[in-house]
């Protein structure tokens, strides 16, 4: 990734450099160092100060986005003198050329789509490329299959999510023969972007007085256990007047997902459908297919 890095430094420089691939800021080690500190300041004047690496001549930034431009700063004291150096990291390229409206979602437990729009001032020959790095930064995933609009990449489909972790860094670079294209980057939590499938194996069994609905939790990309799920059941009497309210029942996830409700014979025709969500986010799945029970002459 090309980036216009400019240093602002006193006469004897620390030679500060930044590698955007590893998010590592490093500088020349000084003899008899007594104090070292590194931090960045973003455009909103927020300061991020990571821990120094063991050698104390570098530091790694974990959860940062760079597309708005940042300034890195290193302070080093030695027994003889103090050093300070700033490194400006602007998002070079023409304003408004970066990909915009970027979003991703995981679906069917192991597929992901990311989409974006061409920047408003991007030239006709712009081409965008997506790179994903997991939080451990051990691996970079390049988009294996692009979604195109008139030849321009405006999305990406991934069918192998094994390289992702719970939090991931997404980078959309751009190229053009005419002008420099700005980049866009984003940090996304897999738990916030996953769309669950509806619950599976929905069954209804009735006796003379009650009906028991059972279902299985959906398979998910995230590693979730039963208490992480919330369910909603829509029990609906068929052939009712339009505008009649459905009965929506909230049920917490359990090892055995079941809901028992009173329904005596003869019972009118009903349908039940279920949807699922992460209990902490309540991003509801689509509804399962309706299961019918009861009879028309109930």
């Amino acid at each position: 990734e090309k980036s216009d890095l400019r240093t602002v430094a006193p006469a004897s420089s620390l030679n500060v450099r930044f590698d955007s691939r590893t998010m590592n800021l490093s500088w020349d080690c000084q003899e008899n160092t007594t104090f070292s500190k590194c931090f960045l300041t973003d455009k909103k004047n927020r300061v991020v100060e990571p821990r120094l690496s063991n050698n104390e001549c570098s530091c790694t930034f974990r959860e940062i986005c760079l597309h708005e431009g940042v300034t890195f700063e290193v302070h080093v004291n030695t027994s003889q003198r103090g050093f300070q150096q700033k490194l400006l990291y602007p998002n070079s390229g023409r304003e408004g050329t970066a990909a915009q409206n970027f979003s991703c979602f995981i679906y069917n437990a192991d597929l992901m789509n990311c989409t974006w729009a061409r920047g408003p001032t991007a030239p006709r020959d712009v081409q965008y490329f997506l790179y994903i790095r997991n939080s451990k930064r051990r691996r970079e995933i390049r988009c294996p299959y692009y979604i195109q609009d008139s030849g321009t990449h405006v999305g990406c489909h991934l069918d192998n999510l094994s390289g992702l972790t719970s939090r991931n860094y997404f980078l959309v670079n751009g190229t053009s023969r005419e002008i420099g294209i700005q980049f866009f980057d984003s940090l996304l939590d897999t738990k916030k972007i996953e769309r669950f499938n509806p619950p599976s194996n929905v069954t209804v069994r009735c006796n003379t007085t009650h009906c028991l609905v059972r279902w299985k939790q959906p398979r998910t990309y995230q590693k979730l256990s039963y208490l992480d799920f919330q369910y909603q059941l829509d029990v609906h009497r068929k052939n009712t007047q339009p505008g009649t309210e459905n009965l929506l029942i909230n049920v917490s996830g359990d090892l055995e997902n079941r809901y028992n409700f009173p329904s005596s014979e003869p019972r009118a025709k009903h349908s039940v459908k279920i949807r699922a969500a992460d209990v902490r986010i309540l991003n509801w799945s689509s509804w399962s297919e309706a299961i019918e029970f009861g009879s028309d002459d109930g």
Partner: antibody
Framework: QVQLVQSGAEVKKPGASVKVSCKIS????????IHWVRQTPTKGFEWMGG????????VYAQRFQGRVTMTEDTSIDTAYLTLSSLRSDDTAVYYC?????????????WGQGTMVTVSS | QAVLTQPSSVSGAPGQRVTISCTGS?????????VSWYQQLPGTAPKLLIY???KRPSGVPDRFSASKSGTSASLAITGLQADDEADYYC???????????FGGGTKVTVL
Amino acid sequence: QVQLVQSGAEVKKPGASVKVSCKISGHSLSELSIHWVRQTPTKGFEWMGGFDPEENEIVYAQRFQGRVTMTEDTSIDTAYLTLSSLRSDDTAVYYCAIVGSFSGYPYRPWGQGTMVTVSS
Amino acid sequence: QAVLTQPSSVSGAPGQRVTISCTGSGSNIGAPYDVSWYQQLPGTAPKLLIYHNNKRPSGVPDRFSASKSGTSASLAITGLQADDEADYYCQSYDSSLSGSVFGGGTKVTVL
């Protein structure tokens, strides 16, 4: 009704090993994450280890590393805890439990507990 | 020494409200990791009362409630009953230990 039934009480000599079993009924072990926790009157509850979905493997508490082994036989829905080089301060009630969520690791349900006494 | 700190005992008359505190650190409750609460009757295994800081599993009465703020959490029991007499434990995950951590337990006595 999902239940965890553990093996019976054990009395062991210092330096020996103990193997505790935990049989799951009402659910398939392959779909569950089992952790092991022990309880003593002096130290209270101590987490020993269990399946970690992020690592996709069984992880052990640092203080038991090298002495503890956790295994599973999914064909008979049974989890096992083996603790070796036993010392008197390993005398405790050992519990298996199902992880209900990977956020904070709440445990539900628990086995009934297995009392292990280490005495010469 | 338990990683999470709880008072050793609290007591209250039937019908009263009692609260139990649980103090952790920036590597567990303040990380922030969710807090769970358990009830343990003598000679039995612990029973989950609260998970995800404030959620009750099915079958747990709404007399039990909990909250979390910063590096601390608390459990409240309202309308205290004789069968609430038990030991109560808080539990969370600790990133520095890479595993679950527990409080030392609080004995609740119904006067």
